[in-house]
């Protein structure tokens, strides 16, 4: 675009030079050249001369019109036809830029992840402005009536240390750009509801070579939360379905899950945890990747089978990922598993 | 109480600078986003410049690559410095606490005259 020029004359844009994508626009050009008569006045959009609605208004002005301006930036400039001179002569020249009001942020939700040192919160914007929209974070505590302002564009990452004078408070975002402001709705925020454990990692599997292979999942997180709840999501690598195990976790020592798996395939597994009676889920952890050893015994069993004596019923989800870049968007389908009850051992046995 | 004391504006002409400030007090300046708005003659007020705790900014457009805003919590003081300044940024200029809004808390401003 156009940063700075020296003119020759004046340049203005009606409505303005920032307005509301699809609105009627008139350009204006007045020239004020020394020595020059113009016998034609030209305009010019990104460079390209325009032949079309141009009206000659006086002997300095003339004017370019166009119908539902729809093009998010351009650069427009106009030129003179001096007598007696090869070239045009430039006269001024601007940017315009064109877009849409913010739609009030939704979705918005703020969280702490655990050791971050930060609250990070995050919204939808909407539909593309096309023109610069700031977005204003208002954290006003509900117990000091105290607010805090932050600007951000996309999302924001508050510091704790600046909201140790209160564990409640209010939280909205604003959006603002040249052609309007919205308001979100407000968020009620309880500082000790909203962390996520530190991240949990899968760091190992192994397959037994018994006669009834099982595959234990080895995995930990550096969590100092007591109590965890966790969903473990597997499945094998040819197929679309995942399986989901729920369960308690102690992270005081490494998580040990057992799966009786079909022998000689290829599995992921995911985990994810939050603190237990709180809405705010880790993302799911990395994939990992295990390969069941082949079958040894003569029974073929089944994903579901357990070898446990004293079962419960626990309900499981199955889900079905609707595309490989959105793992978390699924579809729930309802499956029955069954949680063993090991007698002894101080780790979490789940069959 | 919260206290805004503006000062620095002048009578300076088209193309010329000037640094406005505003002493604050009453409040933990570090932790308060800040904000400039200004009143030509015979106008309404109009929102100009804001700034965060972090010094994250935001500008209005007729203002924008012009004016700068800042703050030094060390000395609790906001700043706006106003170059290449036009006859039309003739108007009294105020701060207020906040980002954003065409609002002041009733202090007493600072005069910018833009002329020639």
């Known amino acids: 675009g156009i940063t700075s020029i020296n003119c020759s004359g004046d340049m203005w844009v009606e409505p303005g030079e920032i307005f509301q994508m699809g609105m009627n626009v008139s350009i204006y050009c007045q020239e004020a050249l020394k020595h020059c008569r113009p016998r034609n006045l030209y305009f010019y959009k990104n460079g390209f001369k325009e032949e079309f609605d141009i009206t000659r208004i006086n002997r300095t002005t003339a004017r370019i019109w166009y119908k539902g301006f729809s093009e998010p930036h351009a650069y427009m400039h106009c030129t003179a036809e001096c007598p007696g001179h090869f070239q045009e002569t430039l006269i001024c020249g601007k940017d315009i830029s064109s877009g849409h009001p913010p739609d009030a942020p939704s979705n918005l939700t703020c969280v702490i992840y655990e050791y971050s040192g930060n609250m990070t919160c995050t919204w939808n914007t909407g539909k593309p402005t096309y023109i610069d929209t700031k977005y204003i974070v208002h954290v006003k505590s509900l117990e000091t009536e105290e607010e805090q302002q932050y600007l951000a564009s996309s999302y924001v990452k508050i510091s704790t240390d600046s909201l140790q004078g209160s564990r409640k408070y209010l939280v909205w975002v604003q959006a603002v750009n040249s052609l309007g402001m919205e308001n979100s709705q407000q968020l009620h925020v309880h500082l000790d509801d909203i962390v996520i454990p530190s991240a949990s990692i899968i760091s190992r599997a192994e397959t037994t070579n018994d006669t009834v292979p099982k595959t234990i999942v080895y995995w930990k997180s550096k969590t100092m939360i007591e109590k965890v709840f966790c969903e473990m999501r597997y499945k094998t690598t040819t197929n679309q379905t995942w399986s989901v195990k729920e369960f308690d976790a102690n992270f005081t020592y490494v998580q040990q899950s057992e799966f009786y798996l079909e022998p000689d395939s290829k599995y992921v597994f995911q985990v994810r945890c939050q603190e237990t009676g709180k809405r705010n889920w880790q993302p799911w952890s990395s994939p990992f990747v295990h390969q069941t050893s082949q079958e040894t015994g003569k029974r073929n069993w089944q994903p579901w089978s357990s070898p446990f004596v004293h079962q419960t019923s626990q309900t499981v989800s199955q889900v079905t990922a609707k595309s490989s870049h959105e793992p978390q968007k699924m579809e729930m389908l309802s499956a029955t598993i069954f949680r063993g009850h090991p007698a002894s051992g101080n780790h979490q046995d789940i069959g | 109480q919260v206290q805004l004391q503006e000062s620095g504006g002048g009578l300076v002409q088209p193309g010329g600078s000037l640094r406005l400030s505003c002493a604050a007090s009453?409040?933990?300046?570090?932790?308060?986003?800040m904000r400039w708005v200004r009143q030509a003659p015979g106008k309404g007020l109009e929102w100009v410049s804001g700034?965060?705790?972090?010094?994250?900014?935001i500008y209005a457009d007729s203002v924008e690559g012009r004016f700068t805003i800042s703050k030094d919590n060390a000395k609790n003081t906001l700043y706006l410095q106003l170059n290449s300044l036009k006859t039309e940024d003739t108007a009294m200029y105020y701060c207020a606490q906040g980002v954003y809004g065409d609002t002041y808390s009733g202090s007493q401003g600072t005069q910018v005259t833009v002329s020639s």
């Open positions: 009453g409040f933990t300046f570090r932790l308060s986003a």
């Open positions: 700034i965060d705790s972090r010094g994250s900014t």
